[in-house]
């Protein structure tokens, strides 16, 4: 079953290479277990950036080596991606799946264009 997912159109990463955005889904029911996946689309290639599952009201659990962190509040997921560089600029798509209880719902956002600008190196000071 399909579900609507909303996310901001554009986000600018900080000079430290950190970008945050909210992924909001219109839950048709009372989901207790949710899976969130962030995918990057660039040059028609789609790659998985990170994925997490969480029980409603709990923290998101990403893999240890993940570049993502996140928190949830109701039907909103606050996602943060770190370690970004200019080459990581692209469309970051939020995918939400309501895993339990049945029925299973799937929603895919339109994507957030994240722009990353590498900071200029500091000039040597005499």
């Amino acid at each position: 079953k399909a579900m609507h997912v909303a996310q901001p159109a554009v986000v600018l990463a900080s000079s430290r290479g950190i970008a945050s955005f909210v992924c909001e889904y219109a839950s048709p029911g009372k989901a207790t277990e949710v899976r969130v996946t962030v995918l990057r689309q660039a040059d028609s290639q789609v790659t998985e950036v990170c994925a997490a599952t969480y029980m409603m009201g709990n923290e998101l659990t990403f893999l240890d080596d993940s570049i993502c962190t996140g928190t949830s509040s109701g039907n909103q997921v606050n996602l943060t991606i770190q370690g970004l560089r200019a080459m990581d600029t692209g469309l970051y798509i939020c995918k939400v799946e309501l895993m339990y209880p049945p029925p299973y719902y799937l929603g895919i956002g339109n994507g957030t264009q994240i722009y990353v600008i590498d900071p200029e190196p500091c000039p040597d000071s005499d």
Epitope: T37, L39, T47, E48, A51, I108
Partner: nanobody, 119 residues
Amino acid sequence: EVQLVESGGGVVQAGGSLRLSCAASGGTFSFYGMGWFRQAPGKEQEFVADIRTSAGRTYYADSVKGRFTISRDNAKNTVYLQMNSLKPEDTAVYYCAAEMSGISGWDYWGQGTQVKVSS
């Protein structure tokens, strides 16, 4: 055109095992993910398990965790569901599904295979 064909369903006693297979045909392709869903009579469709190609990461519904194992053979374009310690409540039609890319959703579905667990 991609086709998914399930096999391996049947009738089994509670506590028994079955192995479902889902073979993809119709071309050479690399799916982002393949999964299993089930639907019991008069009930909503339920996610069972899936496996994502990139890292071979697996995910299971709590109701089957520790009893079911999903695996895939990329060379054969086939995904398997090994079901152990079956319970009467596992009785359902099991459907295989595949998604081409992570943002396409479940593009392809099989016709389903019936699993009946008798007590």
